[in-house]
């Protein structure tokens, strides 16, 4: 007997072929011998089966000896053995209908778990194999669980249900609600304007929620809330902002914050959280601010950085067009009695310059002795 797998809500064609390519009498019945459809003359007739209103046949194919039955909007309970009676012979087709659904909303926060449940007909023993958009393979039986969703799990999951060497494929769209980046660092010279951007890794028709940026300055003993805001249908409105610093926020997505000037006392790290309406949990993005200052005081040329820097970063003072260089894996470098000229302070990571500041050292003339 032929086995056909179908998907819940889908349409399936059960084929039945006669040896002679001509119009002939045929009937489709279920395992209880209840007539579903058949022909009387040229007319398609329907029987008392529950399926009848969803069953059809293609008249144009009858001349080719093809007496298929098409079942629309498949239900799990349509799983049965169907019998096609044509030319005094009986053809049996076993239809198995499966459904695969996500237990929760398909819009999930990063870190949350996803459970896919398989609906299957009694007596079947299917196996399920799912592949994430990122290429992760997960296998299971009646349920498939993904304990901690990651950003790269966003997209179309392809799940293959196998039974009796036959397969049927399901596609489920999963949206992982997260920021595009888990963390980002902004490098600025003292006094420069700072732009923080928090792009989302998803798009929703309506996006409503509230958020806050907490800031831990390197020089401060505790963190403080710099800004709180509301998000309504992708429109941003500020609720509360500190007086120092006076942050500005863009009214449209992506979330965008402007700090008028980078100062050493602002250097540090922040955590932007976004709570979305009707979702439990929050989206997080860490942001770091590194500030550089180059100063000359009397006979001392100093370059300093504040904020979260990794120990492998190098801070250098270099005289332009000259070989004179002072480098340290530290947060401050200095040169005593620097030569006159344009000095560069460089913060670099494995030779890649992250931040630079130029300072001009003017020649110092001896002070004339008073007569």
């Amino acid at each position: 007997k032929k086995v056909v797998l179908g998907k819940k809500g889908d349409t399936v064609e059960l084929t039945c072929n006669a040896s002679q390519k001509k119009n002939t009498q045929f009937h489709w019945k279920n395992s209880n011998q209840i007539k579903i459809l058949g022909i009387q003359g040229l007319f398609l007739t329907k029987g008392p089966s529950k399926l009848s209103d969803r069953a059809d046949s293609r008249k144009s194919l009858w001349d080719q000896g093809c007496f298929s039955m098409i079942i629309k909007n498949l239900k799990i309970e349509d799983s049965d053995t169907y019998i096609c009676e044509v030319e005094n012979k009986k053809e049996e087709v076993e239809l198995l209908v499966f459904g695969l659904t996500a237990n929760s909303d398909t819009h999930l926060l990063e870190g949350q778990s996803l459970t896919l449940t398989l609906e299957s007909p009694p007596g079947s023993s299917p196996s399920v194999k799912c592949r994430s958009p990122g290429g992760k393979n997960i296998q299971g039986g009646r349920t498939i669980s993904v304990p901690q969703l990651e950003r790269q799990d966003s997209g179309t999951w392809t799940c293959t249900v196998s039974q009796d060497q036959k397969t049927v494929e399901f596609k489920i769209d999963i949206v992982v609600l997260a920021f595009q980046k888990a963390s980002s660092t902004v490098y600025k010279k003292e006094g420069e304007q700072v732009e923080f951007s928090f792009p989302l890794a998803f798009t929703l028709e309506k996006l409503t929620g509230s958020g806050e940026l907490w800031w831990q300055a390197e020089r401060a003993s505790s963190s403080k809330s710099w800004i709180t805001f509301d998000l309504k249908n992708k429109e941003v409105s500020v609720k509360r902002v500190t007086q120092d610093p006076k942050l500005q926020m863009g009214k449209k997505l992506p979330l965008h914050l402007t700090l008028p000037q980078a100062l050493p006392q602002y250097a540090g790290s922040g955590n932007l959280t976004l709570a979305l309406e009707a979702k439990t949990g929050k989206l997080h993005q860490e942001v770091n601010l590194v500030v550089m200052r180059a100063t000359q005081f009397q006979e001392n040329l100093t370059c300093e950085v504040w904020g979260p820097t990794s120990p492998k970063l190098t801070l250098s003072l270099k005289l332009e067009n000259k070989g004179a260089t002072v480098s340290k894996q530290a947060k401050a470098v200095w040169v005593l009695n620097p030569e006159a000229g344009m000095w560069q302070c460089l913060l670099s990571d494995s030779g890649q310059v992250l931040l630079e500041s130029n300072i001009k050292v003017v020649p110092t003339w001896p002070t004339p002795v008073q007569p």
């Epitope: 889908d10 040229l42 144009s60 001349d63 098409i70």
Partner: antibody
Framework: QVQLQQWGAGLLKPSETLSLTCAVY????????WSWIRQPPGKGLEWIGE???????NYNPSLKSRVTISVDTSKNQFSLKLSSVTAADTAVYYC?????????WGQGTLVTVSS | DIQMTQSPSSVSASVGDRVTITCRAS??????LAWYQHKPGKAPKLLIY???SLQSGVPSRFSGSGSGTDFTLTISSLQPEDFATYYC?????????FGQGTKLEIK
């Protein structure tokens, strides 16, 4: 709600090959047949041919020698190729879902054949 | 091929009128017939299938009848949005064929 979206080149020179694609959104792809129908300016509708998800085709004998309909089940798409076009092939081309009746239809693509 | 012949090729009527369009098949097609409404620049829309079954969402002022070779589409009380071209189609055998169309115009 099933929707059919179609696209392809709108201007061809005689002897070129017409190529159109139709994507099916929001509904079952298997179990149905997928058709191409055309309507020359000021004339009636003409059925070109059909295909199902497994690639089984039926063509209008009047066009059979020049027509190829193919299917890409991974994308829920089907395509029409009509070779050696002439001015007589200028028409609005529609894709449609069919068991016995055509429903729904794509929005239509005007294809003009002109030298 | 089965030839489908519609009459009249055009008809003028007013809002509220009752209009009947006929379709004749060149051979017996039982009730394997559909009716479509087509407006300029739009896709055709299925109105009636299996000769007399009303497609879901289609107003009840549309009705179909007939069997064998002769079929009719009736609009009981014309509405402004009904002015369009109407086609019949046979699904009895390949190739599927359509009538040449009946243009329904405002009088």
């Amino acid at each position: 709600q099933v929707q059919l979206q179609q696209w392809g080149a709108g201007l061809l020179k005689p002897s070129e090959t017409l190529s159109l694609t139709c994507a099916v959104y929001g509904g079952s792809f298997s179990g149905y047949y997928w058709s191409w129908i055309r309507q020359p300016p000021g004339k009636g509708l003409e059925w070109i041919g059909e295909i199902n998800h497994s690639g089984s085709t039926n063509y209008n004998p009047s066009l059979k020698s020049r027509v190829t309909i193919s299917v890409d089940t991974s994308k829920n798409q089907f395509s029409l190729k009509l070779s050696s076009v002439t001015a007589a092939d200028t028409a609005v081309y529609y894709c449609a879902r069919v068991i016995n009746w055509f429903d729904p239809w794509g929005q239509g693509t005007l294809v003009t054949v002109s030298s | 091929d089965i030839q489908m012949t519609q009459s009249p090729s055009s008809v003028s009527a007013s809002v509220g009128d009752r209009v009947t369009i006929t379709c004749r098949a060149s051979q017996d097609i039982s009730s394997w017939l559909a009716w479509y409404q087509h407006k300029p620049g739009k896709a055709p829309k299925l109105l009636i299938y299996a000769a007399s079954s009303l497609q879901s969402g289609v107003p009840s002022r549309f009705s179909g009848s007939g069997s064998g070779t002769d079929f009719t589409l009736t609009i009981s009380s014309l509405q402004p949005e009904d002015f369009a071209t109407y086609y019949c189609q046979q699904a009895n055998s390949f190739p599927y064929t359509f009538g040449q169309g009946t243009k329904l115009e405002i009088k």
